[in-house]
């Protein structure tokens, strides 16, 4: 459940360099890119994963409506900051020194500035509505079937409590899953919502994150269940900050 | 925090049956609760499962369809059974995980007995 | 994901010691618990996560294995620990028959 002695390598992070050099000349993991070590017996932060994966050779009507302070990750892939335990650090920069406040999923929550730009503190997220569509099957997958497996899924496979899983709304084709997460509610040891849900994006576009682990292969009373595009909505405890002309 | 089932009986073969566990000192919401049973001088089976939080459940694969599980009160969940026949005679127990997000049943109760006989 | 344990009993003197293994039809990812269970009382939780003991289990108990391959050790045998003992796999609860092994009964002499 930690990083495998056998083979030194590590289950829930392929995107890491493992030795026999930790206490004891037990596994050791590192991430890529930022040389951090990790928890092999979890989910890695988003942080650490962007920071690896940028440091890698490059090759309706029982549906939520995301609210006006919902964000979504339109900028892509940046080379991010961490700090010393994988969170983003709220300031983020790039090389031209362009700057910007991110939450705790790493998603731009304000304008881009310049060097004097101040982020007090890192925003948590503690709402996030992954919105998905699956391909057309014959009949319409039934509900409590298909809420009965998402959670599970959460649960087994990113090891996220089922009590975070707020909600599974369902109107052929779109499928929505509401993760909820306070900071009052996260605990020692519990997987962030965040992360969670980033792993789950990274399944559903066949780029697993998992080491030898296969891919996802979600089934719904054995019927596949395949999904043909993904959206996340992010919500902030404290709404972001954009100045009108980004809204008009 | 303990639990406690209720509900065992001698029935007849092709009766219903639902049992009961209490829990005390703990709230349910941050758990999964687990039915497993065990047959005189068998071992033990997974019969099914329920996440509070969510509702949702999970079953055996031969258990599914003829068991269901339901949180009936903040305090208790149910199992029910129905076309009983002589091998569902078993002491069955109400198990809770541990908190985190594997299946380790860390808190049992002690049983209860149901007898399936003409 | 089915769980196979061997033996199905096994004796030993005080002061001995006993093993027993476990295999998964699957990986698990030592994601496993062994449980002792003594006549007219709930199964105990005596090891976690493959190695890990439980609160309160002496350290004669020792878990191993990953991956398929699993085994608890017992030494320095008690009176006290004769029972009989179970795995069970805590990775998944989606279609599978029994989480459970099928136990093993340990006499102590």
């Known amino acids: 459940h930690t990083a495998a002695q056998d083979n030194c390598t590590c289950p829930t992070n392929k995107m890491t360099v493992c030795s026999p050099d930790g206490p004891g000349g037990r596994c050791q993991c590192r991430a890529l890119g930022s040389g951090v070590a990790v928890d092999c017996s979890t989910l890695t932060s988003k942080c650490l994963l962007l920071k690896a994966r940028m440091s890698a050779p490059k090759n309706a009507r029982t549906l939520v409506r995301p609210n006006e302070h919902a964000l979504v990750d339109n900028d892509g892939l940046y080379d991010p900051d961490c700090d010393p335990e994988g969170r983003f650090k709220a300031r983020q920069c790039n090389q031209t020194s362009v700057c910007w406040c991110v939450n705790s999923v790493g998603v731009r929550r304000t304008d881009k500035g310049d060097l004097s730009l101040r982020c007090d503190e890192l925003v948590r997220t503690h709402h996030i509505l992954i919105d998905l569509r699956h391909r057309p099957t014959a009949s319409a997958f039934n509900h409590s079937d298909l809420d009965a497996e998402l959670r599970r899924l959460f649960r087994e496979r990113y090891r996220l409590h089922p009590k975070f899983v707020a909600a599974v709304h369902y109107e052929q084709p779109t499928i929505q899953i509401e993760l909820r997460q306070n900071t009052s509610q996260k605990a020692a040891g519990d997987v962030d919502i965040g992360d969670a849900a980033y792993y789950f994006e990274r399944d559903v576009k066949g780029e697993s994150l998992f080491q030898g682990r296969g891919g996802l292969d979600l089934r719904v009373r054995g019927e596949p269940l395949q999904v043909e595009r993904t959206l996340i909505y992010y919500l902030d405890e404290i709404p972001p900050k954009f100045s009108m002309k980004r809204l008009t | 925090q303990s639990l406690e089932e209720s509900g065992g009986d001698l029935v007849q073969p092709g009766a219903s049956l639902t049992l009961t566990c209490k829990a005390s000192?703990?709230?349910?919401?941050?758990?999964?609760m687990l039915w497993v049973r065990q047959a005189p001088g068998k071992g033990l089976e997974w019969i099914g499962c329920i996440y509070i939080s969510g509702g949702t459940t999970y079953f055996a694969s031969w258990a599914t369809g003829r068991f269901a599980i339901s949180k009936t009160s903040s305090t208790t969940v149910t199992l029910q059974m129905t076309s009983l026949t002589a091998a569902d005679t078993a002491t069955y127990f109400c198990?809770?995980?541990?908190?985190?997000?594997?299946?380790?049943?860390?808190?049992w109760g002690p049983g209860t007995l149901v007898t399936v006989s003409s | 994901y089915d769980m196979t344990q061997t033996p199905a009993s096994v004796s030993a003197a005080v002061g001995g010691t006993v093993t027993i293994k476990c295999q998964a039809s699957?990986?698990?990812?030592?994601?496993l618990a062994w449980y002792q269970q003594k006549p007219g009382q709930p199964p105990k939780l005596l090891i976690y996560d493959a190695s890990d003991l439980a609160s309160g289990v002496p350290s004669r108990f020792k878990g191993s294995g990953s991956g398929t391959e699993y085994t608890l050790t017992i030494s320095d045998l008690e009176c006290d620990d004769a029972a009989t003992y179970y795995c069970q796999q805590a990775y998944t609860i989606g279609n599978i028959d029994n989480a459970f092994g099928g136990g093993t009964e340990v006499v102590v002499k």
């Open positions: 198990a809770r995980d541990d908190g985190t997000t594997s299946y380790y049943l860390n808190l």
């Open positions: 000192g703990f709230d349910l919401n941050n758990y999964a």
């Open positions: 699957e990986d698990i990812y030592s994601l």
